[in-house]
């Protein structure tokens, strides 16, 4: 059913999200996950 397959805010389970990369010290990306899954 829809409720079983979708996250409570309506985003499909397993759909990738793409956070903006974080550069707290200017150079390296310190994002926790590059392309985390939404569960």
């Amino acid at each position: 059913s829809y409720s079983m397959e979708h996250f409570r805010w309506g985003k499909p389970v397993g759909k990738k999200r793409r956070p903006v990369k974080v550069y707290p010290n200017g150079a390296e990306d310190e994002s926790a996950e590059a392309f985390p899954l939404e569960f």
């Epitope: 985003k11 990738k16 999200r17 956070p19 903006v20 990369k21 974080v22 550069y23 200017g26 990306d29």
Partner: antibody, heavy 113, light 110 residues
Framework: QQLEESGGGLVKPGGTLTLTCTAS?????????ICWARQGPGKGLEWIGC???????TYYASWAKGRFTMSRTSSTTVTLQVTSLTAADTATYFC???????WGPGTLVTVSS | DIVMTQTPASVSEPVGGTVTIKCQAS??????LAWYQQKPGQPPKLLIY???KLTSGVSSRFKGGGTGTQFTLTISDLECADAATYYC????????????FGGGTEVVVK
């Protein structure tokens, strides 16, 4: 590492403008997120979108889709083209390296006849 | 679209005081939240990322907290140099327009 915007100025309503974000001290070849935001006079910050300079993938705020186009034009430059300009587009436009303190000083765009 | 609601719009406190700014997301954003300080005529400066991590070189008087939809920025032992406008921003998802700024909070130091 620094960023600097250029290309701002006075534009007539309905016109098109291309802003350039130039990097110094680093290259876009590594695949950084370069993002654009704007700030109207006396107003808050508004996110426009980001470009992944490695893949060339672009991501826009819903309100910016259609009139705004971001491109990587060289290893040190990214452009933002804005079409069908109106007075509501009058703002200081900033480019930034993802989420960081590396922001350009901004370039002022004034849309007026 | 993710909406970031920031309160208050303006706050005034004396030197040495404490200010707390709140930011509420319209949906969960995990800990993908940044806080910026902006002074007139300058670009924003990143203070905090990942909701609570302090950027290198930023005073420990700035403290971020929260997760999910409710976040706070607390500035303690206020100094005159803290007078600025502060913005929260989520960077949760650039695919689905999840990168919006809060409306800003002007901090006046008396």
């Amino acid at each position: 590492q620094q960023l600097e915007e250029s290309g701002g100025g006075l534009v007539k309503p309905g016109g098109t403008l291309t802003l350039t974000c130039t990097a110094s001290g680093f290259s876009f070849s590594s695949g950084y997120d370069i993002c654009w935001a704007r700030q109207g006079p006396g107003k808050g910050l508004e996110w426009i979108g980001c470009i992944d300079t490695g893949s060339g993938n672009t991501y826009y705020a819903s309100w910016a889709k259609g009139r705004f186009t971001m491109s990587r034009t060289s290893s040190t430059t990214v452009t933002l083209q804005v079409t069908s300009l109106t007075a509501a587009d009058t703002a200081t436009y900033f480019c930034a390296k993802g989420i960081s303190s590396i922001w350009g000083p901004g370039t002022l765009v004034t849309v007026s006849s | 679209d993710i909406v970031m609601t920031q309160t208050p719009a303006s706050v005034s406190e004396p030197v040495g005081g404490t200010v707390t700014i709140k930011c509420q997301a319209s949906q969960t954003i995990s800990s993908d939240l940044a806080w910026y300080q902006q002074k007139p005529g300058q670009p924003p400066k990143l203070l905090i990322y990942a909701a609570s991590k302090l950027t290198s070189g930023v005073s420990s008087r700035f403290k971020g907290g929260g997760t999910g939809t409710q976040f706070t920025l607390t500035i303690s032992d206020l100094e005159c140099a803290d007078a600025a406008t502060y913005y929260c921003q989520t960077y949760y998802d650039i695919i689905d327009d999840g990168c919006t700024f809060g409306g800003g909070t002007e901090v006046v130091v008396k």
